[in-house]
């Protein structure tokens, strides 16, 4: 039975040209994480394999950095980076857990304005 839960950073916004950390955390399970895949819509951005380490898509090599931890850092953000991101945790013996993050990339002034009036 799958008892674990994925906690994510949820819906986040960031400035165009800036960077953002996408984070997921698997809790409430003792299952062993064998691999974490990071996907944007239907595109595979990166893999972190428990034995063989990080692998980054050649298309994103210059803008994606592994970590911190099992998270992913997106750099030099553009408006086209707006959208859904998924962390897919492959575990043994539980199976697959998926977390969703929505990223909105805003023009600099809009991001600043939004931050000033953010409701906690």
């Amino acid at each position: 039975m799958m008892t674990g839960t994925i906690e994510t950073t949820g819906n986040i916004s960031a400035e165009k040209g800036g960077s953002i950390i996408l984070q997921c955390h698997l809790s409430s399970t003792t299952a062993q994480v064998t691999q974490v895949n990071w996907e944007q819509q239907d595109q595979l951005l990166a893999i972190c394999n428990a034995d063989l380490g990080w692998h980054i898509s050649p298309s994103f090599k210059d803008r994606v950095a592994p970590g911190p931890g099992l998270g992913l850092t997106l750099q030099s953000l553009t408006v086209n980076d707006t959208g859904e991101y998924f962390c897919i945790y492959h575990t043994y013996p539980d199976g697959t857990y998926t977390g969703r993050i929505f990223l909105e990339v805003l023009e600099s002034s809009v991001a600043e304005h939004g931050a000033r009036f953010q409701i906690p």
Epitope: T34, Q35, N37, L44, I47, N49, L52, G53, H55, I56, S57, P58, H90, T96
Partner: antibody, heavy 117, light 106 residues
């Protein structure tokens, strides 16, 4: 043209070590990880481990963590894989391969290692 | 890790035949599947990546398809140089290979 050229066949006695080389050409050696894999007779390919020539960092699957060593000589664009404490089950064709993101795009021709007393 | 099972393991065919090789995963492979060709004593050659993308320089008679756990490699009209062993590889969960399919001359 990307090429990976491996060293020749080896015959070793049980308990000995073997070191296989893989010379890369046609691309910037430090920009891609090199993997080592093997295929025993009648078996499927299996991964031994990986090295990032840029920083020398190595990764191994559990099965080979204590017996395999992977190194590079970046000045010679060459990767090496040494396997110690050889036994008959290590008789296999050993391959080096370049990984491009998530899959292997260029491979060496293979090196047959025979372990026999 | 996902286990890949290819079928058939051996296949006898003639020049001009249409050939289909199947690769089945023990779990969803999510289209993260690759096909290689290997000839005796030679380096494996990348044919198809991400299920259906033809690698540069590979003839268009080779094609790939599939989703979920089932994938196929098709050679539309077998040529003399196509007699070889073909194997699949997945990277959705672990990095694993199929056992190979040997295509022989009938």
């Amino acid at each position: 043209e990307v090429q990976l050229v491996q060293s020749g066949a080896e015959v070793k006695k049980p308990g000995a070590s073997v070191k296989v080389s893989c010379k890369a050409s046609g691309y910037t050696f430090t920009e891609h990880s090199i993997y080592w894999l093997r295929q025993a007779p009648g078996q499927r390919l299996e991964i031994i481990g990986r090295i990032d020539p840029k920083n020398g960092r190595t990764y191994f699957v559990d099965k080979f963590k204590n017996r395999a060593t992977i190194t590079t000589d970046t000045s010679a664009s060459t990767a090496y894989m040494e396997l110690s404490s050889l036994r008959s089950e290590d008789t296999a064709v050993y391959f080096c391969a370049r990984i491009d993101g998530f899959y292997f795009d260029f491979w060496g021709q293979g090196t047959l290692v025979t372990v026999s007393s | 890790d996902i286990q890949l099972t290819q079928s058939p393991s051996f296949l006898s065919a003639s020049v001009g035949d249409r050939v289909t090789i199947t690769c089945k995963g023990s779990q969803n492979v999510n289209k993260y599947l690759v096909w290689y060709q290997q000839k005796p004593g030679k380096a494996p050659k990348l044919l198809i990546y991400s299920t259906d993308n033809l690698q540069s320089g590979i003839p268009s008679r080779f094609s790939g398809s599939g989703s979920g756990t089932e994938y196929t490699l098709t050679i539309s009209s077998l040529q003399p140089e196509d007699f070889a062993t073909y194997f699949c590889y997945q990277y959705n969960n672990g990095f694993t290979f199929g056992q190979g399919t040997k295509v022989e001359i009938k």
